[in-house]
């Protein structure tokens, strides 16, 4: 065999170069035929009207032809013929890669509720070969289930992802990423998850700052409720008792002036939205007022240069409990 060709892989719309090479040239006619066995070039003459075929090089040892704006219909075997006796023939296969025409992501629900399982579909249309679809939730790769539909040598791939959503997923992108030999770089589409969740309630003591509640002091608690949608109702109640008469409620704030022991108990902040309700409890314990501290005693001896100061602080015996948990979220 004296005639050589190489297979060609080209992306749709780009340029394919077909080369027929003769090792030992003897001025025999070289001819290039298309998959329908029509002559594209006979030496430097093109019988075919298709002007996408252009002669790049012609000599007794090579016939080199370019095919611009390649389409899927150009795919197939192209034959090089050398008119020796006997005639020689060799073929090159043009493979056309088609990137996906369209990448569409579709979420079953625009808004999901925490704990719910939602279906997300991603479709890569009309590619060749079939596209590989990968799923990511943020930076985490997830596993989907793909179905391939073939039509006229083209493939449409639909990948289905079943996703159980959590409140942390709110605002996180779900990314459908395509891998295909005709695609360089990252081809992806994404949708941001919108997850509704019941409120998370947290009680913050805004006064007193040091956190120790004593008789006669004031107490201010702020209820922070975060949810989606934002909680519509934030209420304060006293568990198993009436709210003290001197308690003042102002939106998410509870203010109790002039604390006394009768104020001891559990104060609950409740918040709700369309998803559900939640609460957080604060256990108030009012400590005795502080006892007065006597002036410090200083003993000085003339025999030494050392001064010893003894400071005695007398506090309520339960004061050590101030480090214990005072608020419980539910």
């Amino acid at each position: 065999q004296n005639l050589f060709t190489k297979d060609v892989t080209v992306i749709e719309g780009e340029v394919a170069t077909i080369s027929c090479q003769v090792n030992k040239s003897d001025d025999s006619v070289i001819q290039l035929l298309n998959p329908n066995r029509q002559t594209i070039y006979f030496r430097d003459f093109r019988p075919l009207k298709d002007s996408r075929f252009q002669l790049l090089n012609f000599s007794s040892s090579e016939l080199k032809v370019s095919l611009t704006n390649v389409s899927i219909s150009d795919e197939g075997r192209y034959f090089c013929q050398l008119y020796t006796d006997p005639p020689q023939e060799s073929y090159t296969t043009i493979t056309v890669l088609v990137p996906p025409r369209n990448l569409m992501i579709d979420i079953q629900k625009d808004t999901a509720v925490e704990g719910e399982e939602i279906e997300v579909n991603c479709t890569a249309m009309a590619s060749k070969p079939a596209t590989t679809i990968r799923w990511f939730k943020g930076n985490t790769e997830l596993k989907g289930k793909s179905e391939v539909e073939e039509w006229s040598d083209m493939y449409t791939v639909t990948s289905q992802l079943m996703l159980k959503v959590h409140k942390e997923d709110d605002g996180v992108p779900v990314i459908c990423q395509v891998e295909h030999p005709a695609v360089t770089g990252n081809l992806q589409t994404q949708r941001y998850l919108e997850v509704q969740y019941k409120p998370q309630v947290h009680i913050q003591m805004t006064y007193p700052l040091q956190g120790l509640t004593r008789e006669g002091d004031a107490l201010e608690l702020t209820c922070e409720a975060i949810g989606k949608p934002q909680p519509v109702m934030v209420t304060w109640v006293r568990v198993d008792d009436e709210m003290p008469q001197h308690a003042v409620l102002s939106g998410p704030n509870l203010f109790i002036n002039n604390l006394n022991k009768t104020d001891n108990g559990t104060y609950r902040c409740e918040a709700s939205n369309i998803v559900g309700k939640a609460h957080s409890d604060y256990m108030l314990y009012v400590y005795d007022p502080p006892t007065t501290i006597p002036p410090p005693t200083t003993t000085t001896t003339t025999t030494t240069t050392t001064t010893t100061t003894i400071l005695t602080i007398i506090t309520d015996s339960r004061a050590g409990e101030e480090g214990s948990i005072r608020a419980v979220d539910h």
């Epitope: 029509q38 006979f42 019988p47």
Partner: antibody, heavy 115, light 107 residues
Framework: EVQLLESGGGLVQPGGSLRLSCAAS????????MNWVRQAPGKGLEWVSG????????FYADSVKGRFTISRDNSKNTLYLQMNSLRAEDTAVYYC?????????????WGQGTL | QSALTQPPSVSVSPGQTARITCSGD??????VSWYQQKPGQSPVLVIF???KRPSGIPERFSGSNSGNTATLTVSGTRAMDEADYYC??????????FGTGTKVTVL
Amino acid sequence: EVQLLESGGGLVQPGGSLRLSCAASGFTFSSYKMNWVRQAPGKGLEWVSGIGSSGDWTFYADSVKGRFTISRDNSKNTLYLQMNSLRAEDTAVYYCAKDLGTSGWNFDYWGQGTL
Amino acid sequence: QSALTQPPSVSVSPGQTARITCSGDRLGETYVSWYQQKPGQSPVLVIFEDNKRPSGIPERFSGSNSGNTATLTVSGTRAMDEADYYCQAWVGSTPFVFGTGTKVTVL
């Protein structure tokens, strides 16, 4: 004026040989591809063979491949067709035809033919 | 058996239009030429590359080619147009295939 004048036709036994000549004038012979076309009595036209302008390549119809040889002598402005192993079905008027010389391949001038 | 098929004959009145067809697989993808041959004479190129006229050929000769059919149209036919007409194309990988020929008679 372009002129093509064929000669060399005649009666020959099956298996015999003949050499046809075509004398060209009125154009730059060495710049054009040349061809032989034949027409059997009462039949249509059939292309037989073609040759490059400098004689560097030749091409034949399957029906004559291996039996006929086309050649040219640009110094004499003459085209030849050597016909060997002749068969009854080779009986025809043989025309030499000049190429139009465009990007295509068309026969714009023909000789009067030789039988 | 030619791969290019023409009607054996076409009759036309003087001054009328004669249409000669030439059929072949995917013919529209390649260039077609037309030759006129009067009795006892050599062929004459009248149309090349589907629709181009060589110098000296009257404007009444025109050509078209698409799909599987090429057509030679002779408008305002004259008695001098009476002849055999052959289409010619590169068919597949076979060069210079001539059609079966059409005899045009001017009535």
